[in-house]
Interface confidence: low
Amino acid sequence: AMHVAQPAVVLASSRGIASFVCEYASPGKATEVRVTVLRQADSQVTEVCAATFTEKNTVGFLDDSICTGTSSGNQVNLTIQGLRAMDTGLYICKVELMYPPPYYLGIGNGTQIYVIDPEPCPDSD
Amino acid sequence: AMHVAQPAVVLASSRGIASFVCEYASPGKATEVRVTVLRQADSQVTEVCAATFTEKNTVGFLDDSICTGTSSGNQVNLTIQGLRAMDTGLYICKVELMYPPPYYLGIGNGTQIYVIDPEPCPDSD
């Protein structure tokens, strides 16, 4: 398996935005890289978002995704937004080198994202 | 050394309040227990607060302390308030059995407290 590194812990901002870098030790100069973010909580794993990065397309994820990301060299800068306290969990970065062959797969150890819901602002009189 | 248990991670609320339990394995029925909270950040250790609990006085800490706490059996429920993002760090629970002899000392592994500053509320017009 290919080695994937990501930070152990990240705090979401009070606006519910968390950013972290997912770095992979590519055994070759990949021209097409697929990055998937998985969330693990209570032994359940769900896919949060996924994007394919190429040499020409270094900005990924669909418009309706909660993730945005940019690729640079062997790392992807990921941002997840719209997070609430209930979204606290382990966010795992999965990297696949799609092209050129051979195919490589690497899965990080996960980034524990902590989210705190903000206190509501008092109503203005 | 006496065993002291405390949670690995605690999130402060958006109001800057963090609570956790510090539990100690007392080798005897201590009538006077001193609890000190230490903060470790950048290899610097500073004392945050300290209180002595007795059978009669189960509520500790001085009025001007940022800590409040209650003692029950072999555990102390600690609350630290007024926390800001810059206060994020490892908070270590140190427990001393002061009376009756013999004296016992136990130090926990620390609780990583994460603090996120809230976004300011918009000015009311």
């Epitope: 080695h3 590519s26 100069k29 092209y99 050129p100 051979p102 195919y103 490589y104 | -």
Partner: antibody, heavy 125, light 107 residues
Framework: QVQLQESGPGLVKPSETLSLTCTVS????????LSWIRQPPGKGLEWIGY???????NFHPSLKSRVTISKDTSKNQFSLKLSSVTAADTAVYYC???????????????????WGQGTSVTVSS | DIQMTQSPSSLSASVGDRVTITCRAS??????LAWYQQKQGKAPKLLLY???NLQDGVPSRFSGSGSGTDYTLTISSLQPEDFATYFC?????????FGQGTKLEIK
């Protein structure tokens, strides 16, 4: 043990298609890749291209328009076809098992770890 | 394409000598480098992969070093069977180009 054996006509006429076969044993065609390399008389080595275990292929840009690499898993055979040959294609042609080696931090480094003995091809009318 | 420049192109040495051959890549190849030995009329044989890792069955007198763009193959004490041509090859993105070779001859 791992063995590779190239075979094909020793003489090919200009403008025709050169067809070579590499018969392998001792390893699975569904697990490893295979590269073709050539060496013109008295010269260095030139990588032609590879086919990976999943059927993906990749070729040297200078030969891409003329090369086809395929495999027949049932016969344990790989084949190389080079069209529109000229005298410049005269060389010893080698097939080599292409491996992703793993060590240390768990990602692969490729190498051509086993080679056939080579087959000499002359392009002449 | 990444170019591999190997030096020297030929080398005369005696049995027992310590020999070094260098290979320079035109860009960082992140240790994705292999060294091969080829004897007259024979196929190349893999000596080292990942710049420093000895292939199974290769004598320990062969060693590799380097990182980034500059790599070295060292034979600590030449044996009669070591006189051959040596090639480096990068495997960092295709095409996987070879150095032009170093012919090691008996002095």
């Amino acid at each position: 043990q791992v063995q590779l054996q190239e075979s094909g006509p020793g003489l090919v006429k200009p403008s025709e298609t050169l067809s070579l076969t590499c018969t392998v044993s001792g390893f699975s065609l569904t697990s490893y890749g295979l590269s073709w390399i050539r060496q013109p008389p008295g010269k260095g080595l030139e990588w032609i291209g590879y086919i990976w275990y999943d059927g993906n292929t990749n070729f040297h840009p200078s030969l891409k328009s003329r090369v086809t690499i395929s495999k027949d898993t049932s016969k344990n055979q790989f084949s190389l076809k080079l069209s529109s040959v000229t005298a410049a294609d005269t060389a010893v042609y080698y097939c080599a098992k292409t491996e992703g080696h793993y060590y240390g931090s768990n990602y692969g480094y490729y190498a051509l770890d086993y080679w056939g003995q080579g087959t000499s091809v002359t392009v002449s009318s | 394409d990444i170019q591999m420049t190997q030096s020297p192109s030929s080398l005369s040495a005696s049995v027992g000598d310590r020999v070094t051959i260098t290979c320079r890549a035109s860009e960082n190849i992140y240790s994705n480098l292999a060294w091969y030995q080829q004897k007259q009329g024979k196929a190349p044989k893999l000596l080292l992969y990942a710049a420093t890792n000895l292939q199974d069955g290769v004598p320990s007198r062969f060693s590799g070093s380097g990182s980034g763009t500059d790599y070295t193959l060292t034979i600590s004490s030449l044996q009669p069977e070591d006189f051959a041509t040596y090639f480096c090859q990068h495997l960092w993105g295709t095409p996987y180009t070879f150095g032009q070779g170093t012919k090691l001859e008996i002095k």
